[in-house]
Interface confidence: low
């Protein structure tokens, strides 16, 4: 679709005749009737077949013709097409005196003719008017031409339809050829395909419009390069969605079991050393003077029993005193003013003289100690409970009620589900709270390690001489396939070179 | 015609910054990209990058973000790339060139400018 | 990254043979956005062939390109003594837009 453009320019018709030759009275009043046609190379009566125009009055006899004429008439003359340009035509320019009103073919008197040219050639599409002048005996008209497309037509044809637009269906200007040129950020063959944030992951991330980066399920972040790992994973990382790969000292299947208790908690006061025993249990060695699962508590000086031989102990700011039973003295009442005469020794002990009789000892009998078998036995008041066993005092005896998944004497074993090697392969085992976990080999997975994955073991890239490299999924081993001129089982000896074996 | 004029020939101290200009002429500026390639002594050609002359919207090579900045100035049609950190690595005549932004092809390009970095 | 690769990397012929350049992609490519340029010493580069098959304004018709996917072919017809130069293939189908490494082509 597009636009022939005529535009008169200029008239001269100095003696005022018609193509008779007749003058016109009082003066020829002229208008022009334009008639345009498929290219013929002689130019014939017969239809407009690219249409036709005609004009008011324009002037008399001579005259210049402006830009827009005035009265109704338009310069340039507008011939539309809508049909593909063909490139050539045909042009007849008719000039009509009229002398009334009424400029109709069949208003008019046969000879009111004045002159009537006619071209033809060809004519490109462009916005350059080509200018000409014809002239007759009695007449010269001056005139330029063009063809246009009309808005949204492009091509050297005017056949091409483009509509600029910015919307779902694309967003594009038109180049002059007709050509979509996609507003930047977008792409594609209809620009509807947006251009996603510089560095968006490729497969990961996508964009529904320019500059986004949308991320699909599982990952994460500006550019959609994080992986997002496992709902409920607490001290763990990824490497792709929705894994768990514990940090070190975690374990368990979301890595929130704590296998490294003291590092992370510090359960121990006072300057006690820590040790991890398993799943969130450890163990606090406590410095002197302190005591308690935690060694929380501080020891008072008279807790250790310092006086003997059933002497009081009373605490003081710069540490105790004992205050010595009858017969007793020293600091810790450890002198003795008496011998087995004063039957010193109580709770059934027996009494043994020493040094010719200046002194004695007491052999207690069982449950019962010091010096004169005073004190009855606590068999738990040295805490011998290991990993926050309870002591309990069973008559001559004690014994130690040990917390989950500790056993011994002193609930000083751990009650290890690894004990029986339950993980195959060459799996690591991780003792934990409510079971164990396998940390398994290259090569195999599951809970106990016990299936066999494929190893990638071309990965180490063991093919020399760009030879190409095939994993046998049943071994675990490669192969590789030797290009032309070059042998051995990673293709590393040119053929015609042997290899030097040392034998 | 259309044409894209650069810049004479710079010399670098390793460290420093370079800025190369490329100003367009027969066309309408803001319906085009360009696009900035580099091309190192005998070696073959690297694309380092694209700006939209339209909103200035941009999208840098990997391996160059970071240094790299791509401008345009619509008032003068002028599209600029400025490399910091110079290395002798990045010895090379750059070259900018046109593209459609759904014709991703280079056409036409600048005569290109060489860019030496040397202590 | 795409990775273009194109063979061979030198090819030694006379005016008047036919050449055939090759550009394989690491993975497969929209014809629409490939390209082949042309390169002189001392020039820029210059647009032979887009879309895989179009040639651009003003190249002549001994000039042609085919190919689709990994595989797409540059073929000079009937080699004209201006015709020896450096070619490269590129694609901008991914970012990052990538250039094959050149094929030069040199008189025998």
């Known amino acids: 679709s597009g636009v022939f453009q005529l535009q008169l320019q200029e008239f001269i018709n100095e003696r005022g005749v018609l193509a008779s030759g007749r003058p016109c009275e009082p003066g020829c009043r002229t208008f022009f009737r334009v008639c345009l046609k498929h290219f013929q190379a002689v130019v014939s009566p017969g239809p407009c077949t690219f249409g036709t125009v005609s004009t008011p009055v324009l002037g008399t006899n001579s005259f210049a013709v402006r830009d827009d004429s005035s009265g109704g008439g338009r310069n340039p003359l507008q011939l539309p097409f809508n049909f593909t340009w063909p490139g050539t035509f045909s042009l007849i320019i008719e000039a009509w005196h009229a002398p009334g009103d009424d400029l109709r073919p069949e208003a008019l008197p046969p000879d009111a003719l004045i002159s009537k040219i006619a071209i033809q050639g060809s004519l490109a599409v462009g916005q350059n008017w080509l200018l000409d002048e014809q002239t007759s005996t009695l007449t010269r008209l001056r005139y330029s031409y063009r063809v246009i497309c009309s808005d949204n037509y492009y091509g050297d044809n005017c056949s091409r339809l483009c509509k600029k637009r910015n919307d779902h269906f694309g967003h594009y200007v038109c180049q002059p050829d007709g050509n979509l040129s996609c507003l930047p950020g977008w792409t594609g063959e209809y620009c509807q395909q947006p251009i996603c944030l510089s560095g968006c992951h490729e497969q990961n991330g996508y964009c529904s419009k320019p500059a986004e980066c949308l991320c699909r399920p599982g990952w994460q972040g500006r550019l959609c390069n994080e992986c997002i790992p496992h709902n409920g994973c607490r001290h763990g990382t990824c490497s792709t969605p929705w894994q768990c790969t514990c940090d070190e000292g975690w374990g368990g299947l979301f890595c929130d079991q704590d296998l490294n208790y003291c590092t992370h908690h510090s359960p121990c006061k006072n300057g006690a050393t820590c040790s991890n025993s398993g799943q969130r249990s450890y163990t606090c060695t406590c410095r002197p003077g302190y005591t308690g699962v935690d060694c929380e508590l501080e020891l008072s000086e008279c807790d250790s029993n310092p006086c003997r031989n059933g002497g009081s102990c009373k605490d003081q700011e710069d540490g105790y005193h004992c205050l010595c039973p009858p017969g007793y003295y020293g600091l810790h009442c450890e002198h003795s003013t008496l011998s087995c005469a004063d039957s010193p020794c109580f709770n059934g002990g027996s009494c043994r003289e020493r040094n010719q009789g200046a002194n004695y000892a007491c052999e207690c009998p069982p449950n019962f100690t010091g010096s004169n078998c005073e004190k009855k036995v606590d068999r738990c008041t040295s805490n011998p409970c290991a990993n926050g066993g309870q002591c309990l005092n069973r008559g001559p005896s004690r014994m130690c009620r040990c917390r989950p998944g500790f056993t011994g004497t002193y609930c000083e074993l751990h009650v290890s589900d690894c004990a029986r090697n339950p993980c195959a392969h060459g799996g690591t085992c991780h003792d934990l709270e409510n079971g164990l976990m396998c940390t398994c080999p290259a090569g195999f997975s599951g809970r106990r390690c016990e299936v066999r994955t494929s190893i990638d073991a071309c990965a180490s890239s063991p093919c020399f001489n760009r030879a190409t490299c095939y994993t046998d999924l049943s071994t675990d081993t490669f192969v590789c396939n030797c290009p032309y001129g070059f042998v051995g089982s990673r293709c590393e000896f040119p053929v015609g070179l042997p290899p030097s074996f040392p034998w | 015609q259309v044409q894209l004029v650069q810049s004479g020939a710079e010399v670098k101290k390793p460290g420093a910054s370079v800025k190369v200009s490329c100003k367009a002429s027969g066309y309408t500026f803001t319906y085009y990209g360009i696009s900035w390639v580099r091309q190192a002594p005998g070696q073959g050609l690297e694309w380092m990058g694209w700006?939209?002359?339209?909103?200035?919207?941009?999208n840098y090579a990997q391996k160059l973000q970071g240094r790299v900045t791509m401008t345009t100035d619509t008032s003068t049609s002028t599209a600029y790339m400025e490399l910091r950190s110079l290395r002798s690595d990045d010895t090379a005549v750059y070259y900018c060139?046109?593209?459609?932004?759904?014709?991703?092809?280079?056409?036409?390009w600048g005569q290109g400018t060489l860019v030496t970095v040397s202590s | 990254e795409i990775v273009l690769t194109q063979s061979p990397g030198t090819l030694s012929l006379s005016p008047g043979e036919r050449a055939t350049l090759s550009c394989r992609a690491s993975?497969?490519?929209?014809?629409?956005?490939l390209a082949w340029y042309q390169q002189k010493p001392g020039q820029a580069p210059r647009l032979l062939i887009y879309g895989a098959s179009s040639r651009a304004t003003g190249i002549p018709d001994r000039f042609s390109g085919s190919g689709s996917g990994t595989d797409f072919t540059l073929t000079i017809s009937r080699l004209e003594p201006e015709d020896f130069a450096v070619y490269y293939c590129?694609?901008?189908?991914?970012?990052?837009?990538?250039f094959g490494q050149g094929t030069k082509v040199e008189i025998k």
């Open positions: 590129q694609q901008s189908a991914f970012s990052p837009w990538t």
């Open positions: 700006i939209s002359a339209y909103d200035g919207n941009t």
């Open positions: 993975q497969s490519v929209t014809g629409s956005y």
């Open positions: 060139a046109r593209y459609s932004w759904n014709k991703h092809w280079f056409d036409p």
